[in-house]
């Protein structure tokens, strides 16, 4: 069982390989000096049907380096960064893992592209392994919370409340969604 030629890459090179390309072979992509690699650099020859070989993912791309590009802090609810730190320049990558009791959907790594957006795939999502969710928390007068546009929330996540200037937060600032589907505290209030 073998794979066909690896997908080509513009403005870059593919690591050395011999043919036929055996299942288990890894090929690696790199870009010319003025270009930045966007996407996973390593492709693996696998077989899904024990008959034909196929590459396990699409090839990355080489983008012309844009020194003005910068990407915003990527947020994955229920997840955390295991690699990557601000500032995020063109070609920088961030890798995520999920918190305990969350499982990942999608690709764990994303790259800062020339268009100031993370890619080439969407940010991963971390899905709660618990079926229970906490109901949406109410807004508070003269205050805000971090999940204004989110409905129900998965266990393990938290909501942070804050007050407008001139108001004092009374109660818990951070409320956690418990595995029971209940919140760890009642919402606080904002008092003058």
């Amino acid at each position: 069982i073998s794979c066909g030629s690896p997908p080509p890459i513009l403005n870059g090179r593919i690591s050395y390989y011999s043919t036929p390309i055996a299942v288990g072979t890894v090929i690696r992509y790199s870009c010319s000096g003025t270009f930045r690699l966007i996407g996973e650099k390593s492709l693996l020859c696998i077989t899904k049907d024990k008959v034909d070989g196929t590459w396990d993912k699409p090839a990355p791309k080489c983008e012309y380096f844009n020194k003005y590009s910068s990407c915003p802090e990527p947020i994955v609810p229920g997840g955390y960064k295991i690699r990557g730190s601000t500032p995020y320049r063109h070609g920088d990558s961030v890798t995520f893992a999920c918190k305990t009791n969350f499982s990942m959907n999608g690709n764990k790594s994303v790259w800062c592209q020339a268009n100031n957006m993370w890619g080439p795939t969407r940010l991963p999502t971390c899905v709660s392994v618990f079926p229970l969710e906490c109901p949406a928390l109410p807004m508070i007068h003269n205050g805000h919370h971090t999940s204004e546009n989110v409905g129900s929330i998965a266990p393990g996540l938290s909501v942070t409340y804050s007050c407008e200037s001139g108001y004092l937060l009374v109660g818990e600032k951070i409320i956690n969604c418990l595995s029971s589907g209940k919140w760890s505290a009642v919402p606080p209030t904002c008092e003058e």
């Epitope: 090179r13 690591s15 050395y16 299942v23 288990g24 890894v26 690696r28 790199s30 390593s42």
Partner: antibody
């Protein structure tokens, strides 16, 4: 960090086989590849082969092709290396080493297993 | 197999001084090179990967450079714990190691 714990030292007769185990703890066994690297006394490091446990795919260095078999048991997070038709030149410390995904470099190593081949 | 050649075989340097170790690949390997440190009776330890990226927990005095066929590991100010054997390893095409450089106290 992933810990790799290998089986104990072995003394073998020429012509026989040896099977060394490498148990991983921490991390996800299915998300990495395990290589076997050996080091003869006072010598350098020599790559023998590697397995990607989630796929069950093993590949071998040409020098060891037909004489080495690398397997993995996902249920126990353990990789195995069996070397057959042993000769005195196979006396070495055998290491298992882990590469995250298919990065190509080894973040974690087992403590090594000394295999002595002697009549 | 890509042949990796390290030089010198033995390097004698005084503590506090700078050490420069070389590794040459038999063919172009881009930046697919790692450096390891090995002390007697121990397994190797990853220092540098992708030719110049320090592994987690490795002190800043260790730095790697080079691409293509010529690579260098530099230890800026040698500490007593740095005297060991150093290996380079390529992962452009499967895997192979250099024969090692022994760094000893002068």
């Amino acid at each position: 960090q992933v810990q790799l714990v290998q089986s104990g030292a072995e003394v073998k007769k020429p012509g026989s086989s040896v099977k060394v185990s490498c148990k991983a703890s921490g991390g996800t066994f299915s998300s990495y590849a395990i290589s076997w690297v050996r080091q003869a006394p006072g010598q350098g490091l020599e790559w023998m082969g590697r397995i990607i446990p989630i796929l069950g795919i093993a590949n071998y260095a040409q020098k060891f092709q037909g004489r080495v078999t690398i397997t993995a048991d996902k249920s126990t997070s353990t990789a195995y290396m069996e070397l057959s038709s042993l000769r005195s030149e196979d006396t070495a410390v055998y290491y298992c080493a882990r590469e995250e995904d298919i990065s190509g470099y080894y973040q974690d190593w087992g403590q090594g297993t000394l295999v002595t081949v002697s009549s | 197999e890509i042949v990796m050649t390290q030089s010198p075989a033995t390097l004698s340097v005084s503590p506090g001084e700078r050490a420069t170790l070389s590794c040459r690949a038999g063919q172009k390997i881009s930046s697919y090179l790692a450096w390891y440190q090995q002390k007697p009776g121990q397994a190797p330890r990853l220092l540098i990967y992708d030719a110049s990226t320090r592994a987690t927990g490795i002190p800043a005095r260790f730095s790697g450079s080079g691409s293509g066929t010529e690579f260098t590991l530099t230890i800026s100010s040698l500490q007593s714990e740095d005297f060991a054997v150093y290996y380079c390893q390529q992962y452009e095409y499967w895997y192979s190691f250099g024969q090692g450089t022994k760094l000893e106290i002068k």
